[in-house]
C-alpha cells in the first residue's frame, strides 16, 4: 500500500485546515491507527492527535478543541484531520504515521502554510501646496504573510518608492507616493492597491488629493466702459479667482470708503443707480489660508450730457 497526502496545504488565517492522509492499501489490509505529529526542524515531534480504528479520535491537550475528524461519511482508510481556526503559529511541517496490518507502518509529511491577509492603512503626507517641489502625497502600509504587494492606481503623475520589513512570521511593506503639487491634481483620487494570495480580491484605499493654491484675481464688469454712465441701474463688478481652500472676497475703495448704497455680496460689488460719486479705484482682495491676491480697477462714471456736448464739438470741428 501507499500513503496519499499533499506536499503543501495552504489555508487563510482563521480558516480550518484539512490535513490529508489516505492509505491506499491492498485488499485485506486494515488501518489500526493514524498518528499526526508536528515535526518542525530542530524540535522534537509533538503529537497533535491519534485516530484509532476502534477507540476513535485522541487529541493532544495542546490542541484540545482544535482537532477533529472530517464529517461523515468516513473511509476507514482515511486518516485526515481538520485543524480548526488556523493561526500563524500552526505554520510548519506535519507528519502522518499510519499503522496498518499486516503491512506495517507508513509515514508522509506535508507543510502547512497559513496565509495572513494584510489590513492596509493609508496615511496622507503633509499638506500639499502649489509651488512645492517633490512632496510625499501618501504612504500605504500592509503587513501579511507572505509579504503583500503594494502598488498605486492614479491618473496623477508621480514617483513611488517601497521598503519592506521582515518580522518572524510576516512582512510589512510600505510604499510612498511622491508628486510635485499642482492645482490640476485637486480632487484627483490616489488609490493604494494591496494584493495578497490570502485575499479574494485586491484591497483598495482611496485618498482624494487636496492641493492648496490661489489663482490670480481679476475683475469683470468693465468690459464696456460706455455702460458706466449716470443713472444706469444694475451695474456690478465681479471678482474672479479660484483656490483651495475656497477663497473669501473683500471689496475696498482705494481713494476712500465705499459709497453709500453699494452692496458687497461675496465676490460681487453691486451699485445703486450710478452717479459720478461712484467713480474711483476699487480693489478686490482675495484670500485663503494659502495666499492672498489683489486686483484693482478704475471706474469712471460717464455723464451722457458731457459726452453729447463733446460729440457735437467733435462733429462741428470736423
Amino acid at each position: 500500500g501507499e500513503l496519499e497526502t499533499s506536499d503543501v496545504v495552504t489555508v487563510v488565517l482563521g480558516q480550518d485546515a484539512k490535513l490529508p492522509c489516505f492509505y491506499r492499501g491492498d485488499s485485506g489490509e486494515q488501518v489500526g491507527q493514524v498518528a499526526w505529529a508536528r515535526v518542525d526542524a530542530g524540535e522534537g515531534a509533538q503529537e497533535l492527535a491519534l485516530l484509532h480504528s476502534k477507540y476513535g479520535l485522541h487529541v493532544s491537550p495542546a490542541y484540545e478543541g482544535r482537532v477533529e475528524q472530517p464529517p461523515p461519511p468516513r473511509n476507514p482508510l482515511d486518516g485526515s484531520v481538520l485543524l480548526r481556526n488556523a493561526v500563524q503559529a500552526d505554520e510548519g511541517e506535519y507528519e502522518c504515521r499510519v499503522s496498518t496490518f499486516p503491512a506495517g507502518s507508513f509515514q508522509a509529511r506535508l507543510r502547512l502554510r497559513v496565509l495572513v491577509p494584510p489590513l492596509p492603512s493609508l496615511n496622507p503626507g503633509p499638506a500639499l501646496e502649489e509651488g512645492q517641489g517633490l512632496t510625499l502625497a501618501a504612504s500605504c502600509t500592509a503587513e501579511g504573510s507572505p509579504a503583500p504587494s503594494v502598488t498605486w492606481d492614479t491618473e496623477v503623475k508621480g514617483t513611488t518608492s517601497s521598503r519592506s520589513f521582515k518580522h518572524s512570521r510576516s512582512a510589512a511593506v510600505t510604499s510612498e507616493f511622491h508628486l510635485v503639487p499642482s492645482r490640476s491634481m485637486n480632487g484627483q483620487p490616489l488609490t493604494c492597491v494591496v494584493s495578497h494570495p490570502g485575499l479574494l480580491q485586491d484591497q483598495r484605499i482611496t485618498h482624494i488629493l487636496h492641493v492648496s493654491f490661489l489663482a490670480e484675481a481679476s475683475v469683470r464688469g468693465l468690459e464696456d466702459q460706455n455702460l458706466w454712465h449716470i443713472g444706469r441701474e444694475g451695474a456690478m463688478l465681479k471678482c474672479l479667482s479660484e483656490g483651495q481652500p475656497p477663497p473669501s472676497y473683500n471689496w475696498t475703495r482705494l481713494d476712500g470708503p465705499l459709497p453709500s448704497g453699494v452692496r458687497v455680496d461675496g465676490d460681487t460689488l453691486g451699485f445703486p443707480p450710478l452717479t459720478t460719486e461712484h467713480s474711483g479705484i476699487y480693489v478686490c482682495h482675495v484670500s485663503n489660508e494659502f495666499s492672498s491676491r489683489d486686483s484693482q480697477v478704475t471706474v469712471d462714471v460717464l455723464d451722457p450730457q458731457e459726452d453729447s456736448g463733446k460729440q457735437v464739438d467733435l462733429v462741428s470741428a470736423s
Partner: nanobody
Framework: EVQLVESGGGLVQPGGSLRLSCAAS????????MGWFRQAPAKQRELVTS???????RYADSVKGRFTISRDVSKNTVYLQMNSLRAEDTAVYYC????????????WGQGTQVTVSS
C-alpha cells in the same frame, strides 16, 4: 507480557477528588494506548479515557471536564485525576494497555474500587 498495578481507589464524598495510578512493567515497549475502564454493578465495562504514546487523549462524554488522564513515560505510569466526583462514578476502575501489534486492550490490571457516597 505487560503487567499493570492500580492504586489510589477509596471512598470519597460527592464533589470530592481522587487520583488513581497505574504502574506498568514487562514488555512496555510494545504498549500503544493506555486507558482506564470502569465497571459498575450490573453494567458493562466502559472506556472512561485513554492516552496515546504521544500524549493525545480521549474522554467519555460523561467525564469530560472532570477527569484528566496523564502519562509519565519515565516512570511507566498512567494517572487518572478525578474531580467533582458523583455517585454515578462509583465503580471498579481498571487500568488497561493496548498492544501495538493487536490494536485492542489486551493487558489489564486487577482493578481498584472507587465509591462516591455521603
Amino acid at each position: 507480557e505487560v503487567q499493570l498495578v492500580e492504586s489510589g481507589g477509596g471512598l470519597v464524598q460527592p464533589g470530592g477528588s481522587l487520583r488513581l495510578s497505574c504502574a506498568a512493567s514487562g514488555s512496555i515497549s510494545s504498549i500503544n494506548l493506555m486507558g482506564w475502564f470502569r465497571q459498575a454493578p450490573a453494567k458493562q465495562r466502559e472506556l472512561v479515557t485513554s492516552i496515546s504514546p504521544g500524549g493525545s487523549v480521549r474522554y467519555a462524554d460523561s467525564v469530560k471536564g472532570r477527569f484528566t488522564i496523564s502519562r509519565d513515560v519515565s516512570k511507566n505510569t498512567v494517572y487518572l485525576q478525578m474531580n467533582s466526583l458523583r455517585a454515578e462514578d462509583t465503580a471498579v476502575y481498571y487500568c488497561a494497555a493496548e498492544s501495538e501489534r493487536t490494536y485492542y486492550f489486551d493487558s489489564w490490571g486487577q482493578g481498584t474500587q472507587v465509591t462516591v457516597s455521603s
